[in-house]
């Protein structure tokens, strides 16, 4: 091999990558907020709704300080993969009932997928451990009724909003450690 000619900068620095990941997460957070407002407007919810198959919130924003970069990114990726699966399920199961929320739900799904790719790329560039994926979860059962599906939509969007809010704070904190 001859002397190194050097390579032009072909792709963003991990810190720039983290910046754009924060921007994408913020924009996804805003999408989710708007979609939640739309859902509440069209299908008012009575109180909070839960879905057992959703991940539990990673942690309070206050506890973020003690976290390590790998655990934040690994947990965030796992949780977002679960939400992506739930959004896909929601669109399939509730196609006609939630037609008024399209194309916004489709855009949300696309951006969620893009954020997951971004997180994986960031982990690769930093050479952080990429844990094996969770074993495939059993398929989500179709909602028992239209109202059951709407309650599920409230739970999914509400949980995703909290997770993304946590994600923005976590990623900004991690940026200071890079």
């Amino acid at each position: 091999p001859g002397p190194p000619p050097g390579s032009p900068r072909a792709s963003p620095d991990p810190r720039a990558e983290l910046d754009s990941t924060v921007l994408l997460t913020r924009s996804l957070l805003e999408d989710t907020r708007q979609l939640t407002i739309q859902l509440k407007d069209k299908f008012p919810a009575d109180g909070d709704h839960n879905l057992d198959s959703l991940p539990t919130l990673a942690m309070s924003a206050g506890a973020l300080g003690a976290l390590q970069l790998p655990s934040v990114l690994t947990r965030l990726r796992a949780d977002l993969l679960s939400y992506l699966r739930h959004v896909q399920w929601l669109r399939r199961a509730m196609g006609s009932s939630l037609k008024t929320l399209e194309p916004e739900l489709g855009t949300l799904q696309t951006r969620l997928d893009r954020l997951l790719r971004r997180l994986q790329l960031l982990m690769s560039r930093l050479a952080l451990p990429q844990l094996p994926p969770d074993p495939p979860a059993p398929p989500l059962a179709p909602p028992s009724s239209t109202w059951g599906g709407i309650r599920a939509a409230h739970a999914i969007l509400g949980g995703l909003h909290l997770t993304l809010d946590w994600a923005v704070r976590g990623l900004l904190l991690l940026k200071t450690r890079l």
Epitope: R9, P14, Q120, L121, R125, A127, L128, Q130, P132
Partner: antibody
């Protein structure tokens, strides 16, 4: 311009040791995970080892585990590979690479032969 | 024996479209890990050609594109040129090995 410059290769006898270095410039070295990848003459690419951006995580290919050690000095923008108990099958061009890997050095040849 | 499987050779005439496949398993490509592609011109170091399945680094012509489905990925080169003659490698993270794995490489010949 991103530059990765490997050094330390050469001819060594089986059972011997070598230490490869890779000097990085043109990018924020401390923000990138770093790899060593090798290529035996006329063969394909084989990943050897990786170290995380801050040095806290290190992983090795089974073929070099227990014999090779990857390390880095972020203050010197330098990556290292300590190779012990070398075997004939370790003969290859050793590349240092950054990120995905996004950037590659030009490689240094290691020949293990008696 | 490489963890990712590629055809050893491929060929095409100038202007043609050529596709190179890369087959993996459930511990790498099939686990939703991204696939990256490298080009190695004769006597030179590998160069990143496609990352994250279908993203092109700046400076890589849009004649090169990537895709991924299930446990397989492919690299497509359209409008083939003589300077595309090189070895092409796919790579992906493998959780069972805790590191990236490469395909055996495909030697592309422009006839």
């Amino acid at each position: 311009e991103v530059q990765l410059l490997e050094s330390g290769g050469g001819l060594v006898q089986p059972g011997g040791s070598l230490r490869l270095s890779c000097a990085a410039s043109g990018f924020t070295f401390s923000s990138y995970g770093m790899h060593w990848v090798r290529q035996a003459p006329g063969k394909g690419l084989e990943w050897v080892a990786v170290i995380s951006y801050d040095g806290s995580y290190k992983y090795y290919a089974d073929s070099v585990k227990g014999r090779f050690t990857i390390s880095r000095d972020n203050s010197k923008n330098t990556l290292y590979l300590q190779m012990n108990s070398l075997r004939a099958e370790d003969t290859a061009v050793y590349y240092c690479a950054a990120g995905v890997p996004d950037y590659w050095g030009q490689g240094t040849l290691v020949t293990v032969s008696s | 024996q490489s963890v990712l499987t590629q055809p050893p050779s491929a060929s095409g005439t100038p202007g043609q479209r050529v596709t190179i496949s890369c087959s993996g398993s459930s511990s790498n490509i099939g686990s939703d890990y991204d696939v990256h592609w490298y080009q190695q011109l004769p006597g030179t170091a590998p160069k990143l050609l496609i990352y994250s399945n279908n993203e092109r680094p700046s400076g890589v012509p849009d004649r090169f594109s990537g895709s991924k489905s299930g446990t397989s990925a492919s690299l497509a080169i359209s409008g083939l040129r003589s300077e595309d003659e090189a070895d092409y490698y796919c790579a992906a993270w493998d959780f069972s090995l805790y590191g990236p794995v490469f395909g055996g490489g495909t030697k592309l010949t422009v006839l």
